[in-house]
């Protein structure tokens, strides 16, 4: 297993609809054809595999069927979008990238993106 640098933004604020997007960029030391990306959430004394995708370079990301994420890839960048977030989902979201094929296997883990989620205020009752 060889190490690889992964960069991601330090902070992202989710939209009022509970959607957060960020870019995960990895410094590929070679010409990988198969890449696996996993987003981990670390907070509240728990670690959650939020979503995971494997893709062939130049193709769309195929997320596992339980995923709350969508994404696209462009070169060594992966544009990730996480949906359905609530205030209690605020936490550090870590991007993990694995170059699966061809060998050698490379692994890179980012420093994490702190995603802040604020639940929208309920609309006040109205007579109109």
């Amino acid at each position: 297993c060889k190490a690889m640098h992964v960069a991601q933004p330090a902070v992202v604020l989710a939209s009022s609809r509970g959607i957060a997007s960020f870019v995960c960029e990895y410094a590929s030391p070679g010409k990988a054809t198969e890449v696996r990306v996993t987003v981990l959430r670390q907070a509240d004394s728990q670690v959650t595999e939020v979503c995971a995708a494997t893709y062939m370079m130049g193709n769309e990301l195929t997320f596992l069927d339980d995923s709350i994420c969508t994404g696209t890839s462009s070169g060594n960048q992966v544009n990730l979008t996480i949906q359905g977030l609530r205030a209690m989902d605020t936490g550090l979201y870590i991007c993990k990238v694995e170059l699966m094929y061809p060998p050698p296997y490379y692994l890179g883990i980012g420093n994490g993106t702190q995603i802040y989620v604020i639940d929208p205020e309920p609309c006040p009752d109205s007579d109109f």
Epitope: D44, Q46, T48, V50, D65, D66, I68, I82, M88, D89
Partner: nanobody
Framework: EVQLVESGGQLVQAGGSLRLSCTAT????????LGWFRQAPGKEREFVAA????????AYADSVKGRFTISRDNAKNTVYLQMNNLKPEDTAVYYC???????????????????WGQGTQVTVSS
Amino acid sequence: EVQLVESGGQLVQAGGSLRLSCTATGHTYNTYPLGWFRQAPGKEREFVAAISPSGTLRAYADSVKGRFTISRDNAKNTVYLQMNNLKPEDTAVYYCARHRSVGWRASHHLSDYDNWGQGTQVTVSS
């Protein structure tokens, strides 16, 4: 209505292993995340681990990560908790629960889960 039945709890020495099972009855079992929680005497019920509907994504409490493994067999309507390198502080009643919503979540909290089993006692002696 989904019913959850846990089994596998017993007395074990520190450093030992156990595998808990939770079998569900109900048509919607395969579409919901399932979780394990535990409650030690005099303490609040706490999250241990959770698994997504197809079993591809997992979540763990920091205190058990690397020692416990959650898995599920949808053909058998069963979720498992493999517990290795057990410690006295793992002593508790372990409960299986079904998530309130169909989709996977980025975090797991007691309030996210409804259908609860009766629990199985795990005692780790030093």
